[in-house]
């Protein structure tokens, strides 16, 4: 090797300077006793290289480049061989900035999975590889004082989100929480969220269906519908609040919500719709009167209002 | 501190029937599912029966369903269990127990003796 | 109905040893396992819910693990309070399931 960069830093700031030394050794004989020392960025050749021979016989070339505002971009030093350019050595510069505090970070208790999924927004393109990390401990207060460190969540690459496991989790005691995000130009972190799992429990859906028609009961009038749920078997013991919404299967017509229904209902007459008409129906829990999540909207029911029933007039004698 | 407090247990005849009682203090009974929860002697733990917050949702083990009916009085902080049709295998201690959220019984009654027995 | 199984359903260990009880259930239940202790004559104790979660005034020398269809109980060191009999129970549906025990006797 004849030439050797050396550079202040390999990253740094976009836009900010920087400062880079070429040397040839003495011994490249081959080589003009004399050579010029040339500076290429990407494919630009870069003027203002002030150049000087040490006491070692080396040849130095140094160079400050003002703003480094490519993300990415190979310096190379060179010389002139014949017609042609000989590359002496090349070094990748990037350029980016460091890392925003992440930000919107929320965690939801999901049972059927039994771990606590958080995710957050990473903020602006740094133009770096950035990591980042969910960090939490599990604390006996108000996240004051920590407790026992849990092993740190790193999400898949590309992705702002992470699952803690049901192993590492208390039920029932309050953990901190906090992303922090890490890049060659520096750490952010995330502001602290101290929360108990169960205090942000996403539970499952019901299943919805229409009521078995008793023998004995009286059959639905025009235009209701008589409905039930099964609660998901697993948060039966959860106190919940549920809620319905529905809209008729044509037109444009947007959802009406009914609620809110205690999940202990089980079954509901629902009225006041149209007669004769095709209905979409879902239905939602939400722990409650404790803090959780809405479930997400069960999968649909199809159900058909009856007609309306024929008018009869009738005649009163008083007597 | 909380506390449950079973009564109602006795000798009874088969066919016969009993009401057990649980008086629960210490917590706010309303918020909380309820459950009786058996043992034969010298046997294990069966699950009887559950009851909701409001006590609109009832399930039982089908050992008993048709003969015992779960209910609650919110107002005064009792659980209750109805047994009819006793036979001799009803016979245990009854424990009535707070159901935990995610469906785990905690804390327990001292426990009442049902004897079926002619 | 969701079957539970303990074993062994006794053994016989010594003050200071690690015993381990194992819970299998007949059809997954994800971590809806919880762990009693009975002592004769005494209503049950809970000591782990939801498979890991070490109950308020548990001694940590009790823990909790598995997930799915198999769980143990582990005491890292026994302690003479510690003869009684575990049973394991699943809420993951109706009927809650109890496993038939497991006896820890004095060697």
């Known amino acids: 090797e004849c030439g050797h960069i050396s550079v202040s830093a390999p990253i740094v700031h976009l836009g900010d300077p920087i400062t880079a030394s070429c040397i040839i050794k003495q011994n490249c004989s081959h080589l003009d006793p004399e050579p010029q020392i040339l500076w290429r960025l990407g494919a630009e050749l870069q003027p203002g290289g002030r150049q000087q021979r040490l006491s070692d016989g080396t040849q130095e070339s140094i160079i400050t480049l003002p703003h480094l505002n490519h993300t990415q971009a190979f310096l190379s030093c060179a010389l002139n061989w014949g017609n042609s350019l000989q590359i002496l050595d090349q070094v990748e510069l990037r350029a980016g900035y460091p890392p925003a505090i992440p930000h919107n970070l929320s965690c939801l208790m999901n049972l059927a999975t039994s771990s606590l999924i958080c995710q957050w927004e990473p903020g602006p393109e740094t133009h770096l590889p950035t990591s980042f990390t969910l960090k939490s401990f599990k604390s006996r207060g108000n996240c004051q004082t920590q407790g026992d460190s849990i092993l740190d969540c790193v999400p898949k690459d590309g992705q702002s989100h992470c699952s803690i496991p049901r192993k590492h989790l208390l039920l029932y005691q309050n953990m901190g929480i906090w992303v922090q995000a890490e890049n060659a130009l520096g750490t952010s972190m995330s502001p602290q969220l101290c929360l108990d799992p169960m205090d942000v429990v996403k539970l499952e859906p019901p299943m919805l269906r229409t009521m078995d028609p008793s023998p004995e009961a009286a059959p639905p009038q025009a235009g209701c519908l008589q409905l039930s749920w099964e609660p998901w078997q697993p948060g039966l013991h959860i106190n919940q609040k549920c809620e319905l919404r529905h809209k008729p299967q044509r037109g444009e017509a947007s959802w009406a919500l009914v609620g809110p229904l205690p999940l202990e209902a089980l079954q509901y007459e629902l009225c006041g719709l149209l007669p004769a008409t095709a209905y979409t129906l879902q239905i939602r829990c939400i722990r409650w009167p404790l803090p959780g999540h809405w479930s997400d909207w069960s999968p649909s029911l199809e159900l058909r209002t009856t007609e309306r029933a024929p008018t009869h007039h009738h005649h009163h004698h008083h007597h | 501190e909380v506390q449950l407090l079973e009564s109602g247990g006795g000798l009874v005849q088969p066919g016969g029937s009993l009401r057990l009682s649980c008086a629960a203090s210490g917590f706010t009974f309303s918020l909380y599912w309820m459950g009786w929860v058996r043992q034969a002697p010298g046997k294990g733990l069966e699950w009887v029966s559950s009851?909701?917050?409001?006590?609109?949702?009832?399930p039982y083990a089908d050992s008993v369903k048709g003969r015992f009916t779960i209910s609650r009085d919110n107002s005064k902080n009792t659980l209750y269990l109805q047994m009819n049709s006793l036979r001799a295998e009803d016979t245990a201690v009854y424990y009535c127990?707070?159901?935990?959220?995610?469906?785990?019984?905690?804390?327990w009654g001292q426990g009442t003796l049902v004897t079926v027995s002619s | 109905d969701i079957q539970m199984t303990q074993s062994p359903s006794s053994l016989s260990a010594s003050v200071g040893d690690r015993v381990t009880i194992t819970c299998r259930a007949s059809q997954g239940i994800s971590s809806y396992l919880n762990w009693y202790q009975q002592k004769p004559g005494k209503a049950p104790k809970l000591l782990i819910y939801?498979?890991?979660n070490l109950q308020n005034g548990v001694p940590s020398r009790f823990s909790g693990s598995g997930s799915g269809t198999d769980f143990t109980l582990t005491i890292s060191s026994l302690q003479p309070e510690d003869f009684a009999t575990y049973y394991c129970?699943?809420?993951?549906?109706?009927?809650?399931?109890f496993g038939g025990g497991t006896k820890v006797e004095i060697k």
């Open positions: 127990a707070k159901l935990g959220e995610l469906g785990w019984f905690d804390p």
């Open positions: 939801y498979a890991s």
């Open positions: 009851i909701s917050s409001s006590g609109g949702v009832t």
């Open positions: 129970q699943q809420s993951y549906s109706t009927p809650l399931t």
